[in-house]
């Protein structure tokens, strides 16, 4: 006989990202003996939850429950039995759930209450559903793509703890109702609501952060076509020989696309509304959502809103990933500029929808938003954020990062579970046995 | 009614190439599009690659990239496929199949296939 | 990469229902288009956008898809019915076309 080495405990931990417009389940792993160590806890599994978000239940909380139901059992097989009780379980919901709470706050706690009942009902360590505010979600992002990419501490070949000195990358997501931008700055914010100070390993982080709620793609979708409604009566961000029955109440539900509603509209009336495939109407429909006539600080991103000049590396995740890929990836269009995003996203917008399918085959009539999304992506980043031609050059459009998904649940869940400590390693007090 | 004609079957030695032709008789390539799917030995069916001939665009599957060519004759209604480096895991049915708007760009006409050999 | 995952085989009853199912993530965003390959032939179209039949094709194909899972459904299975079922679907991120890797259907009696 020998003695073998048994492999590591592992602990396990879930996080349900409740986002505007679908949930998805992340079960997060680590080796129990090395929870501080830094870039340990990886992705061990996910599950896309079937149907809307958690927020399109408002008018049956008990069917947002219910949705969560095959993603739990699945999280019943992926974590070992014998970890159930230990593993932490929290539910964090987005946009989609703050602006619920706006316009509805008793559907809000109903939703809330209902999945807080279905989830306590499973084995595992739940530890709570919560709506997140946009700085919450901001940083979070922040947190996850810089552990995961190890820029925080790394352990050296010589044996000690140390900080990298490539400093730390900027995030933004673009989520289904709202996006965010999050970065390292060294002056203090002119708005403090839009500075967060954070101590991680015993380094100390001044952070700028801010989310812009209704500026998420779904809602940017809508509050375009309540635009060309309004303006044109065709949509010059869809492609020509696309045409749609758009029902008026779907339009004009969201507190995002409150401005425009008329004044009298029936709900459930029925507008046929057809594409024009017009890159330049569809600029100035895009260019319409932002407003850069006041800005109260020393300088503003948009609407009045503090931002100091983008620096340093970014990472761009979520609907900005999908969007880049799917102009880089399906349309076979290069995306390495500014300038090259600009005129794919032209070239996108000056496809008929007979060119657009035979070019990206199978799909559902989302195909049609391309134009639209990747027109405000551009618009976002380069007028709305103030990247010019060098700092985009310093943006990485990314899914994952050391195969787990980029956004706020891993963040959220090292800060809740302390898997971050304040204190730097070296600090630590333990045993030496050598 | 259009169908799909292929070329005829091919035996070649490991290193080299093959060219396979796929012939539209009845029509044209007019807002259609063709795809290449293999299909080795017992087998299931894998994608290579596609041409959108009307708007000379291709896409090939990541597998195969920067070892198939597909291009297309738009005066001849004829569509090609040519692999390279070929070796034995080769060997396989090649079918050209018609990508049909009114399927949404899915395989709505297949030919029988051309049989490739790849053997030393 | 994504992955369309289909069982082997599927036994069924001469006159009665059989159900091939095709999982893959989020499947239910996506289109799934079915072929049917008998031994020897080039594939056939039997359902496209998740549950539309091809005209020539029997009513008694039928497809649904949501969630993971797309399904195809053959009711009151037939003699000729047995063959190779492969679900398809186009994968965004890579730009390709993907297959499942195919069911063998037996109609048994």
């Known amino acids: 006989t020998r003695d073998v080495r048994e492999p590591p405990a592992l602990k396990y931990g879930i996080v349900l990202d409740a986002g505007s417009s679908h949930t998805s389940m992340f079960i997060y792993k680590w080796p129990a003996d090395k929870e501080n160590d830094t870039g340990i806890v990886g992705q061990h599994s996910s599950c896309d939850v079937p149907g809307g978000g958690i927020s399109s239940y408002a008018d049956n909380p008990s069917g947002a429950s219910q949705s969560l139901v095959g993603c739990l059992e699945q999280a019943l097989q992926d974590v070992p039995k014998e970890r159930h009780a230990g593993t932490p379980l929290y539910l964090g919901a987005t946009a989609g759930m703050r602006l619920l709470n706006l316009t509805n706050p008793e559907a809000s706690t109903s939703v809330l209450m209902a999945v807080t009942h279905t989830l306590t009902q499973y084995p595992f360590d739940f530890r709570g559903a919560r709506i997140l505010s946009g700085q919450e979600e901001g940083v979070f992002g922040w947190v996850t793509a810089n552990y995961l990419l190890e820029n925080f501490i790394k352990y050296g070949w010589v044996g000690r703890w140390f900080r990298p000195r490539k400093g730390t990358l900027g995030a933004m997501d673009l989520g289904g109702a709202s996006t965010q931008i999050t970065f390292e700055t060294t002056s203090p914010a002119e708005d403090r609501a839009s500075e967060v100070q954070l101590h991680l390993y015993g380094q100390h982080y001044r952070v700028y952060t801010h989310s812009f709620l209704c500026y998420g793609r779904d809602q940017v979708l809508q509050r375009l076509l309540a635009s060309a409604l309004q303006t044109h009566g065709f949509h010059p961000c869809w492609p020509r020989g696309f045409s749609t029955q758009v029902l008026l109440g779907d339009v004009y539900q969201s507190p995002c696309t409150m401005a425009q509603r008329p004044q009298n509209f029936n709900s459930s009336a029925r507008v046929s509304l057809s594409g024009s495939s017009d890159p330049h109407l569809c600029r100035d429909l895009v260019s319409g959502l932002f407003s850069f006539s006041s800005c109260p600080f020393s300088r503003c991103s948009f609407n009045g809103v503090f931002q100091p000049p983008v620096a340093g590396n970014f990472v761009a995740f979520s609907a900005f990933f999908y969007t880049v890929d799917f102009l880089r990836t399906s349309m076979g269009l290069p995306v390495a500029t500014l300038q090259q995003l600009e005129a794919a996203a032209v070239n996108v917008c000056n496809q008929t929808w007979a060119q657009l399918q035979a070019r990206v085959p199978g799909q559902r009539a989302r195909l049609a938003d391309y134009c639209a999304g990747a027109m405000f992506v551009q618009q976002l980043l380069s007028r709305g954020y103030g990247f010019d031609e060098r700092a985009f050059g310093g943006v990485i459009f990314q899914k994952k990062a050391a195969d787990t998904a980029v956004g706020w649940a891993l963040g959220y869940m090292l800060n809740l579970t302390n898997l971050i400590p304040a204190d730097p390693p070296g600090l630590r007090k333990g045993t030496d046995f050598s | 009614q259009v169908q799909l004609v292929q070329s005829g079957a091919e035996v070649k030695k490991p290193g080299s190439s093959v060219k396979v032709s796929c012939k539209a008789s009845g029509g044209t390539f007019d807002s259609y599009a063709v795809s290449w799917v293999r299909q080795a030995p017992g087998q299931g069916l894998e994608w290579m690659g596609r041409i959108v001939p009307w708007l000379g665009f291709t896409r090939y599957a990541q597998k195969f990239q920067g070892r198939v060519t597909i291009t297309a004759d738009e005066s001849t209604s004829t569509a090609y496929m040519e692999l390279s480096s070929l070796r034995s895991e080769d060997t396989a049915v090649y079918y050209c199949?018609?990508?049909?708007?009114?399927?949404?760009?899915?395989?709505?006409?297949w030919d029988q296939g051309t049989l490739v050999t790849v053997s030393s | 990469s994504y992955e369309l995952t289909q069982p082997l085989s599927v036994s069924v009853a001469l006159g009665q229902t059989a159900r091939i199912t095709c999982s893959g993530d989020?499947?239910?965003?996506?289109?799934v288009y079915w072929y049917q390959q008998k031994p020897g032939q080039a594939p056939v179209l039997v359902i496209y956008?998740?549950?539309n039949r091809p005209s020539g094709i029997p009513e008694r194909f039928s497809g649904s898809n949501s969630g993971n899972t797309a399904t195809l459904t053959i009711s009151r299975a037939q003699a000729g019915d047995e063959a190779d079922y492969y679900c398809?679907?186009?994968?965004?991120?890579?730009?390709?076309?993907?297959f499942g890797g195919g069911t063998k259907l037996t109609v048994l009696g």
């Open positions: 398809a679907s186009y994968d965004l991120q890579q730009a390709r076309w993907v």
């Open positions: 956008d998740d549950n």
């Open positions: 199949a018609r990508e049909s708007p009114g399927y949404r760009y899915s395989f709505d006409v």
């Open positions: 989020a499947i239910g965003e996506k289109y």
